[in-house]
Interface confidence: low
Amino acid sequence: HNTTVFQGVAGQSLQVSCPYDSMKHWGRRKAWCRQLGEKGPCQRVVSTHNLWLLSFLRRWNGSTAITDDTLGGTLTITLRNLQPHDAGLYQCQSLHGSEADTLRKVLVEVLADPLDHRDAGDLWFPGESESFEDAHVEHSISRSLLEGEIPFPPTS
């Protein structure tokens, strides 16, 4: 699997999409896990509803949500109030029994809040160095990570 990079801004929401073959993965629950080290295990963060027919219902674990369009074949993960510590490698998984197939490997990069450094004199907002919250997916950026490419540092 190639790794797909999703870039989000600190404090905003980042939406990660994982497309899959809806027929091949029919009836399977999905999960989002965080890779612990390069060759370590993938630690489950959140999974879709226990009843596959209700996979469209959004399920939350802390600031991470998952929902599955089983007909269209798209798993969507939302990382709300993105923080620098959210940067790292993740996987979208399709579950069957005790096994898990990788649908997509994802590298999450966290960029600086574009308004976190303003020097605005008396226009300075109290706590302006605090970041945005939850700006949505229209501007989450996705690209393929080329073989051997080094992603830029996830935080500034």
Partner: antibody
């Protein structure tokens, strides 16, 4: 689909007041910074004001050219942004756009024309 | 305030040919975090402006890859690799580094 629809523009005499509204839909309104940008007839763009999101207390900032005369506010229960304009001057004549602010002004309304003239 | 100066103010173009617009800021827009806070917008005739480029060189969602942004701390360029008829309108650069946010005067791009 993100939509921003401005209203409230019109003809007003110098020294008068006007309140513009911007109805927002298609996104979680409370999560976003919102802004007003204006454009005088045949001229360029001028940033007017910004109001921050829920996480940052809905605090506001203004261009010095309007500070003390204009007030930006939002009614989050109605998903609506406002611009209260007082002590209007001829040079405030412009199309006023409301815009969502993320990496830049990423969504804009169609604008509402404010004419200040006696 | 940071002053943004665009050149040229008018640019006649030929469809299929490249085009280039320059923008200069009175202060460096390069922040210590490595990002350059310069945006480009296009206002098509009779329409509202639309965001084309942010952080100097990142295309906004849905913007064709014929548009590209480049530059240094104070000198910036928007390039259209092959102009199409739908690209006509007024292009604005805008600094996003400091309040008040300021725009260039605009460059009117029209078909020859």
């Amino acid at each position: 689909e993100v939509q921003l629809v401005e209203s409230g523009g019109g003809l007003v005499q110098p020294g008068g007041s006007l309140r513009l509204s911007c109805a927002a839909s298609g996104f979680t309104f409370t999560d976003f910074y919102m802004s007003w940008v204006r454009q005088a007839p045949g001229k360029g763009l001028e940033w007017v004001s910004v109001i921050r999101n829920k996480a940052n207390g809905y605090t506001a900032g203004y261009n010095p050219s309007v500070k003390g005369r204009f007030t930006i506010s939002r009614d989050n229960s109605k998903n609506t942004l406002y611009l209260q304009m007082n002590s209007l001057r001829a040079e405030d004549t412009a199309v006023y756009y409301c815009a969502r602010l993320t990496y830049g002004f990423d969504y804009w309304g169609q604008g509402t024309l404010v004419t200040v003239s006696s | 305030d940071i002053v943004m100066t665009q050149t040229p103010l008018s640019l006649p173009v030929t469809p299929g040919e490249p085009a280039s617009i320059s923008c200069q800021s009175s202060k460096s827009l390069l922040h210590s975090n490595g990002k350059t806070y310069l945006n480009w917008y296009l206002q098509k005739p009779g329409q509202s402006p639309q965001l084309l480029i942010y952080w100097m060189s990142t295309r906004a969602s849905g913007v064709p890859d014929r548009f590209s942004g480049s530059g240094s701390g104070t000198d910036f360029t928007l390039k259209i690799s092959r102009v199409e008829a739908e690209d006509v309108g007024v292009y604005y650069c805008q600094q996003f580094l400091e309040y008040p946010f300021t725009f260039g005067q605009g460059t009117k791009v029209e078909i020859k």
